[in-house]
């Protein structure tokens, strides 16, 4: 019951988080005009990952897309990439986790398969959350750097007769949405990973009975099909996570994920 609740909660938290990451990515207010210690202008500037906008006091708002790809700063491109990777991983994670939910029955899917899918989606959510947090943090760092550079310009560039209003940008709402959303996705992912441990089938107390056939030595364990799937107890007397090292007959017996390109 606790496992189902943890898995369900993890799914919901991740869902909210990914929705937040999508919202943050689409938002125009990644950076907003700094109003502190600046002349009060009748124009308010703000910028997003995809376009920059100007809102006049009269209410008129005009947004212009960044139609160039090569002319944009590398950092902005990197942030875009991180956010998109985060969204894609999160979306795949959500899809996987829907089928992994213990409360949803799909055919005769074993708990072990669900456990694996839960772990997979959990890892995807964690990486998705980290991508969003990284993207937002990179952008925030870029803003801080530019803010202090423009502040320096503001006080050094006033030697002439004509003063220019230096528009400085500070953190926009999208940054906070992104941080919170990334954090939620991360938490959801962790919860899914925790739920995976509870979903994994317990080791039985029965001793495995070994039947020695004339050919290969194969151990049969109670549990039917589970023994031959990748999700059950390991049939060979070696660690599951062996770093990819396999015996010759094992490579022949079990198709590897690398066999299909």
């Amino acid at each position: 019951m606790a496992v189902t609740a943890c898995q369900g909660l993890g799914f919901v938290v991740s869902l909210i988080g990914i929705a937040g990451i999508i919202a943050a990515t689409c938002m125009d207010q990644w950076s907003t005009q700094d109003l502190y210690n600046n002349p009060v202008t009748a124009v308010f500037n703000y910028q997003g990952l995809w376009r920059s906008c100007v809102r006049e006091s009269s209410g008129f708002t005009e947004c212009r897309g960044y139609f160039t790809l090569l002319g944009l700063p590398a950092m902005l491109q990197a942030v875009r990439a991180l956010m998109i990777v985060g969204i894609v991983l999160g979306a795949i994670g959500l899809l996987v986790s829907i089928f992994a939910l213990k409360c949803i029955r799909i055919g005769s899917m074993e708990d072990s398969a669900k456990a694996n899918m839960t772990l997979t989606s959990g890892i995807m959510f964690i990486v998705s959350g980290l991508c969003a947090i990284a993207g937002v943090s990179v952008f925030a760092n870029m803003l801080v750097t530019n803010f202090w550079m423009s502040t320096a310009n503001m006080y050094t560039g006033m030697g002439g007769m004509v003063q220019t209003v230096q528009t400085r940008y500070t953190f926009g709402a999208a940054l906070f949405v992104g941080w919170v959303a990334g954090g939620l996705t991360l938490i959801g992912g962790v919860m899914m990973c925790i739920a995976c441990r509870g979903l994994a089938p317990e080791e039985t107390n029965y001793k495995a009975v070994s039947y020695h056939a004339s050919g290969h030595s194969v151990a049969y364990k109670p549990g039917g099909f589970k023994a031959s799937t990748g999700f059950g107890s390991n049939t060979k007397n070696k660690k599951i996570y062996d770093g990819g090292a396999r015996t010759e007959d094992e490579v022949q017996s079990y198709p590897s994920k690398h066999d299909y390109v």
Epitope: P39, G59, F60
Partner: antibody
């Protein structure tokens, strides 16, 4: 048809108060701002202040302490409250609609004359 | 606050002539966000309220004849009337619509020579 009509002007003694009204028709004050501009006899235009659609106001720095702009959206009317009037406040007072582009004024009222004299 | 300086204060001209009015601001009126200059030009005839001619320094208001054009950027702006018509003799004002307070220039009076 957008129309702005100012009223409330007249002769007032120095130190007294006066409230000017700008009745707006054809548009909603919830969507547009209104500027107040004055013009002393034979002089140029002087911006007094503005009340934006959201209700926030901005003023000419020298007038901020004495003048207050407010509005009543239900009556579609903007007010200019002038306190501690001085002789130099004698002018024709205009209200103008804040145009959607460039924060400029595209429609103006005919003006109301305020004379501060003892 | 921004000081708007218009020159010359008065111009005596004849109909059909080309005229250029100057307006200078003490601070740049160029907004980096949209690369637009927040300067407006108005025309005022005696006994009348001002009339909007040009906003964003160069965008002509819909009802304004094509002979009126605005140009300039940053701190230096001009209003050009390509061929003066009798109805164009009036006072022209420029206004800063960027930084509060939204100050006006002193005006340039166009009078008939």
């Amino acid at each position: 048809q957008v129309q702005l009509v100012e009223s409330g002007g007249g002769v007032v003694q120095p130190g007294r108060s006066l409230r000017l009204s700008c009745a707006v028709s054809g548009i909603s004050l919830t969507r547009y701002g209104v500027h107040w501009v004055r013009q002393a006899p034979g002089k140029g235009l002087e911006w007094v202040g503005v009340i934006w659609a959201g209700g926030n106001t901005n003023y000419e720095s020298a007038l901020m302490s004495r003048f207050t702009i407010s509005k009543d959206n239900s009556k579609n009317t903007v007010y200019l409250q002038m306190n501690s009037l001085r002789a130099e406040d004698t002018a024709m007072y205009y209200c103008g609609r804040a145009y959607g582009k460039g924060n400029s004024m595209d429609y103006w009222g005919q003006g109301t004359l305020v004379t501060v004299s003892s | 606050e921004i000081v708007m300086t218009q020159s010359p204060p008065t111009l005596s001209l004849s109909p059909g002539e080309r005229v250029t009015l100057s307006c200078k601001s003490s601070q740049s009126l160029l907004n980096s966000g949209n690369q637009k200059n927040y300067l407006t030009w108005y025309q005022q005839k005696p006994g009348q309220a001002p009339r909007l001619l040009i906003y964003w320094a160069s965008t002509r208001e819909s009802s304004i004849p094509a002979r009126f054009s605005g140009s300039g950027s940053g701190t230096d702006f001009t209003l050009t009337i390509s061929s003066l018509q009798p109805e164009d003799f009036a006072v022209y004002y420029c206004q800063n619509n960027y930084i509060y307070p939204l100050t006006f220039g002193g005006g340039t009076k166009l009078e008939l020579k």
